[in-house]
Interface confidence: low
C-alpha cells in the first residue's frame, strides 16, 4: 500500500436546503483507471461511512442509488455534494481516495471538510 | 461495435460445476462492470453479482455467495461465471452484461442441469 | 433485499393503444431502470434513472415515478412492442428485478 495525497477544503457552510458540496482532490501518480472514493464522518471520536463509490476513469461517478452523495470526477478530482443534511449532521467529512487499479494500489486520506450545518428557522406562518 | 459474446450451451449433472465465459470487444475492457444475471425457463431475471474487470472488485448477491464466483482475464477480454453444487433448479439462461445500465448484453447461455 | 412487484402481468393490448405497465417497490428507491425482452433475446434496455430514454429507444417510451411507484407507458404500440417488460432496482444489493410484465397483442 502507498500514501497518496488528498486534498479537500478546511470548511464548508450547507445551504439552507441542507447540501453541502466540495472538492476532493488527490494526487495520482500514475494514470488510474479505477478509483473508490469514500466519505467518513468524524464527530465525538467516532468515525462512520457516509458514502462511497467505486468508479471507472472517464465513466459517471455512480454511488448506490439511494445514497445522500452524489458526485462527478474529472481527472483527478471528484467533486461530491451530500444531500438531506441537518444541524445534527454538523462534522468532520473526510475524503479517502484508493487506486484500485492498475497497480499498485494507493491510499490517501484528506485532512477532513468541517461541514456546519444549520437548520433554518421555520416560516412564521408556515405550519410545517 | 461493442459485443459480448459467451460460450455455448452446457448439459451438467446434479453437484458439478459449470464456468461461463463471456468475452468482450469494442470497449475498453477494464472500463466497465461486468454484472452476470440468470433467467430460469419461463421466469424473470435473477442478478447473480458483478465484477469491476481492472481490479477484480466484486459483488455478490447473497443468494450465490459461496456457489457462485466471477473472474476475468484481463488479457482476452473474458470474464468468467462459474456456479459450483449444480442443482436442477439452476437450469436457465445465463447471461453477462456491462455495467452501464446494461447497455450491453451477452446472447445467453444455456446451462441445463439434469441428471 | 428490494422486491419489486409488477402488476399486470399481463397485459393485452392492440398496436395503436396505449399501454401503461407498473412496478412497486417493497422500499422507498431513488430511481427505476425498464428493460424489454422479446422471446428468444437477451434484454434490452429501455429506461434509466426512472425517466431516461435509452439510447435508440423511439420517444413512444416514457418512464415516471417516485418512491415506491414506478410506471412504464408506450403511448401507441407498434407490433414490435409486444414483448415482456422488466424493471429494475440498483438502489441497494442485490440488484433486483420485477417479475416481468407481458404484453401481448388482442
Known amino acids: 500500500c502507498k500514501a497518496m495525497h488528498v486534498a479537500q477544503p478546511a470548511v464548508v457552510l450547507a445551504s439552507s436546503r441542507g447540501i453541502a458540496s466540495f472538492v476532493c482532490e488527490y494526487a495520482s501518480p500514475g494514470k488510474a483507471t479505477e478509483v473508490r472514493v469514500t466519505v467518513l464522518r468524524q464527530a465525538d471520536s467516532q468515525v462512520t461511512e457516509v458514502c462511497a463509490a467505486t468508479y471507472m476513469m472517464g465513466n459517471e461517478l455512480t454511488f448506490l442509488d439511494d445514497s445522500i452523495c452524489t458526485g462527478t470526477s474529472s481527472g483527478n478530482q471528484v467533486n461530491l455534494t451530500i444531500q438531506g443534511l441537518r444541524a445534527m449532521d454538523t462534522g468532520l467529512y473526510i475524503c479517502k481516495v484508493e487506486l484500485m487499479y492498475p497497480p499498485p494500489y494507493y491510499l490517501g486520506i484528506g485532512n477532513g471538510t468541517q461541514i456546519y450545518v444549520i437548520d433554518p428557522e421555520p416560516c412564521p406562518d408556515s405550519d410545517f | 461495435q461493442v459485443q459480448l459474446v459467451q460460450s455455448g450451451a452446457e448439459l451438467k449433472k446434479p453437484g458439478a460445476s459449470v464456468k461461463v465465459s463471456c468475452k468482450a470487444s469494442g470497449y475498453t475492457f477494464t472500463s466497465y462492470w461486468i454484472n452476470w444475471i440468470r433467467q430460469a425457463p419461463g421466469q424473470g431475471l435473477e442478478w447473480i453479482g458483478r465484477i469491476a474487470p481492472g481490479s477484480g472488485t466484486t459483488y455478490y448477491n447473497e443468494v450465490f455467495k459461496g456457489r457462485a464466483t466471477i473472474t476475468v482475464d484481463k488479457s482476452t477480454s473474458t470474464a468468467y461465471m462459474e456456479l459450483s453444487s449444480l442443482r436442477s433448479e439452476d437450469t436457465a439462461v445465463y447471461f453477462c452484461a456491462r455495467g452501464d445500465y446494461g447497455s450491453y448484453w451477452g446472447q445467453g447461455t444455456l446451462v441445463t442441469v439434469s441428471s | 433485499e428490494i422486491v419489486l412487484t409488477q402488476s399486470p402481468a399481463t397485459l393485452s393490448l392492440s398496436p395503436g393503444e396505449r399501454a401503461t405497465m407498473s412496478c412497486s417497490a417493497s422500499?422507498?428507491?431513488?430511481?427505476m431502470h425498464w428493460f424489454q425482452q422479446r422471446p428468444g433475446q437477451s434484454p434490452r434496455r429501455l429506461i434509466y434513472d426512472t425517466s431516461k430514454l435509452a439510447s435508440g429507444v423511439p420517444a413512444r417510451f416514457s418512464g415516471s415515478g417516485s418512491g415506491t411507484d414506478y410506471t412504464l407507458t408506450i403511448s401507441s404500440l407498434e407490433p414490435e412492442d409486444f414483448a415482456t417488460y422488466y424493471c429494475h432496482q440498483r438502489t441497494s444489493y442485490p440488484l433486483t428485478f420485477g417479475q416481468g410484465t407481458k404484453l401481448e397483442i388482442k
Open positions: 422500499s422507498s428507491i431513488s430511481y
